[in-house]
Amino acid sequence: SEVEYRAEVGQNAYLPCFYTLPTSGTLVPVCWGKGACPVFECGNVVLRTDERDVNYWTSRYWLNGDFRKGDVSLTIENVTLADSGIYCCRIQIPGIMNDEKFNLKLVIK
């Protein structure tokens, strides 16, 4: 079952997600999506990183931590009840079926 996180309407929500950088030091691409993690990729992508940068995002979503050191925790600004639900943090490790997938449940009250 998903780990549950709570936030109040009008506040910022925080969904933690971390990974350990490979010994090469290069970043692993990460995607965040609304909805449980599918077999591949992320559904309804709200944010994505590549080898160096955040390269896709939608307006209320950002990574406030040091994502270049493996802290890819998601912040959602000014949440509403519509933001409730499951979010997927997917660490896209190279290779077949190597991805790390984390489903996080956000409850807005």
Epitope: D50, E51, R52, D53, V54, N55, W57, S59, R60, Y61, W62, L63, N64, G65, D66, F67, R68, T75, E77
Partner: antibody, heavy 114, light 108 residues
Framework: QIQLQQSGPELVTPGTSVKISCKAS????????INWVKQRPGQGLEWIGW????????KYNEKFKGKATLTVDTSSSIAYMHLSSLTSEDSAVYFC???????WGQGTTLTVSS | QIVLTQSPAIMSASPGEKVTLTCSAS???????LYWYQQKPGSSPKLWIY???NLASGVPARFSGSGSGTSYSLTISNMETEDAASYFC?????????FGGGTKLEIK
């Protein structure tokens, strides 16, 4: 100590191209990104793109795609920026900056004039 | 892309005065990658504050930085003559990296 030494000023005519260099010293060149930044006279700063010397991978600001080409010569620890089809809008000071924007070159002044 | 809006564009302050420069982002950015630079005419930008609140080497303790998400600021607790310069905020978390338009700080 870390240093980024850029090539000297350039005066060129419209329609031509130019190649600006940035020689790095004081660190392992292939381990860190190099960024390029444009500054028009009396104006703000614009990021052009980065290159990772270890792999040659590049990323460009969409605005500068087709205008700037970033390359490196790892044997001499030099990063280059080639600017093509020059117009007066390209007249500016161009800076190279280190991986984390903590070290900057002294800037290269490019003047495009007929 | 993320637009960084700095205000005011130009301001003057007397020696000893407290000065606050602001930088507003159109979307949230990582506080780890929100930087401030000082630039004087004819010189390269100098890293002044990194990761929102950390002073670069050699920067006087009268400078401080704060903020998160979409709102950041640089404060000088007591203005000195040598602080007259342009200050730029910069985010390099989201590609393309962007800079604010700058604040030109003058001495009264």
């Amino acid at each position: 100590q870390i240093q980024l030494q850029q090539s000297g000023p350039e005066l060129v005519t419209p329609g031509t191209s130019v190649k600006i260099s940035c020689k790095a010293s004081g660190y392992t060149f292939t381990d860190y990104y190099i960024n390029w930044v444009k500054q028009r006279p009396g104006q703000g700063l614009e990021w052009i793109g980065w290159i990772y010397p270890g792999s040659g991978n590049t990323k460009y600001n969409e605005k500068f795609k087709g205008k700037a080409t970033l390359t490196v010569d790892t044997s001499s620890s030099i990063a280059y920026m080639h600017l093509s089809s020059l117009t007066s809008e390209d007249s500016a000071v161009y800076f190279c900056a280190g991986d984390r924007f903590d070290y900057w070159g002294q800037g290269t002044t490019l003047t495009v004039s007929s | 892309q993320i637009v960084l809006t700095q205000s005011p564009a130009i301001m003057s302050a007397s020696p000893g005065e407290k000065v606050t420069l602001t930088c507003s982002a159109s979307s949230g950015v990582s506080s780890s990658y929100l930087y401030w630079y000082q630039q004087k005419p004819g010189s390269s930008p100098k890293l002044w504050i990194y990761s929102t609140s950390n002073l670069a080497s050699g920067v006087p303790a009268r400078f401080s930085g704060s903020g998160s998400g979409t709102s950041y600021s640089l404060t000088i607790s007591n203005m000195e003559t040598e602080d007259a310069a342009s200050y730029f905020c910069h985010q390099w978390s989201n590609s393309p990296y962007t800079f604010g338009g700058g604040t030109k700080l003058e001495i009264k």
